[in-house]
């Protein structure tokens, strides 16, 4: 019997605390053979899809979602999901993006190190039905 699809992971580069106006890239990772990665914002009704999927390792594929100039409205919870035909995966844990005013001081670091764990990672609510994601029927709004 085919195993269930592994949950994707999500991380942010260069980190999860980003100065206003700086860039951030969300990285979604899953198994090889992924057709589409989706980055969901806060709720399932707001998401971006990409089929620009690259192989990160022999067993892993990834997609990158970049925000060139972060605004306050970009702060919030993000998570990934993917479609590996003919099934959708479960969602990843949430990753919280924080946007801060740029202090510009030489002693204040611009960002925290990129990580897919730590205090900014929150468990998903797991209310998602792995085989029929609840975003079905909702309009795709662009994240950025």
């Amino acid at each position: 019997q085919e195993e269930d699809l592994p949950r994707p992971s999500i991380s942010a580069e260069p980190g999860t605390v980003i100065p206003l106006g700086s860039h951030v890239t969300f990285v979604c990772r899953g198994p090889v053979g992924v057709q589409t990665f989706r980055l969901e914002r806060d709720s399932r009704s707001t998401y971006n899809d990409t089929e620009d999927v690259s192989q990160a390792s022999p067993s892993e594929s990834e997609a990158r979602f970049r925000i060139d100039s972060v605004r306050e409205g970009n702060a919030g919870l993000y998570r990934c999901i993917y479609y590996k035909p003919p099934k959708w995966s479960e969602q990843s844990d949430y990753l919280e993006l924080l946007v801060k005013e740029s202090s510009g001081g030489p002693d204040s670091p611009d960002t925290e190190p990129g990580s897919s764990a730590g205090p900014t990672q929150r468990p998903s609510d797991n209310s998602h039905n792995e085989h029929a994601p609840a975003s079905q029927g909702l309009k795709a709004e662009h994240l950025y």
């Epitope: 019997q1 085919e2 057709q35 589409t36 989706r38 399932r44 899809d49 089929e51 999901i81 479609y83 035909p85 003919p86 099934k87 959708w88 039905n129 792995e130 085989h131 029929a132 994601p133 609840a134 975003s135 079905q136 029927g137 909702l138 795709a140």
Partner: antibody
């Protein structure tokens, strides 16, 4: 509205090949997959394979790996299925169906009208 | 490959009857099961997705239930336009497979 327009009936000799087409309209061709399904007279439905026009990825039933080849032309929003080395067993109606997954589920939600293929000497 | 077994093969009913069609999978497929209707000389039409989710434009008398290996399509008060073949299909894994179908006919 979503439409899948399939090519006309084919009469072919044993051992030859045919290429069936399925022209999609009413949606973004590259945002969905395209499945092909076989139905012999009075029989059930048999999945042949599926292609994703956005990147050309395709998946086949083991039964037809040496029989069918799926392709897609993004510029004309048309999918194709070539059947080769035809035998009487390939005489059937062939349907194309949109494999819709964009909004987070998967199902063959729209179907073409079918193309009848008759293999006879 | 996942085998889907539909029963009964034929169901003879009178308009107004309520009926249940069964589809059993050879292994657990969660809720990755869809139902299609096919009338004579027509293309299949999607009725129910993911075992129980309704489809826009499909009459509310059609409903689905089940999970794992056992699934049911119910038609509440059959109408004459409902006669034809009904197929279940799984999308849990490649290759996609269909059941052999249940023929709903007039008694």
């Amino acid at each position: 509205q979503v439409q899948l327009q399939q090519s006309g009936a084919e009469l072919a000799r044993p051992g030859t090949s045919v290429k069936l087409s399925c022209k999609a309209s009413g949606y973004t061709f590259t945002s969905c997959g395209l499945s092909w399904v076989k139905q012999r007279t009075g029989q059930g439905l048999e999945w042949i394979g599926e292609i994703y026009p956005s990147n050309g990825n395709s998946y086949y039933s083991d039964k037809v790996k040496d029989k069918a080849t799926l392709t897609a032309d993004k510029s004309s929003s048309t999918a194709y299925m070539e059947l080769r080395s035809l035998t009487s067993e390939d005489s059937a109606v062939y349907f194309c169906a949109r494999a819709y997954y964009t909004n987070g589920y998967y199902a063959m939600d729209y179907w073409g009208q079918g193309t009848s293929v008759t293999v006879s000497s | 490959d996942i085998v889907l077994t539909q029963s009964p093969a034929t169901l003879s009913v009178t308009p107004g009857d309520s009926v249940s069609l069964s589809c059993r999978a050879s292994q657990s497929i969660s809720n990755n099961l869809h139902w299609y209707q096919q009338k004579s000389h027509e293309s299949p039409r999607l009725l129910i997705k993911y075992a129980s989710q309704s489809i826009s434009g499909i009459p509310s008398r059609f409903s689905g239930s089940g999970s794992g290996t056992d699934f049911t399509l119910s038609i509440n008060s059959v109408e004459t336009e409902d006669f034809g073949m009904y197929f279940c299909q799984q999308s849990n894994s490649w290759p996609l497979t269909f059941g052999a179908g249940t023929k709903l006919e007039l008694k």
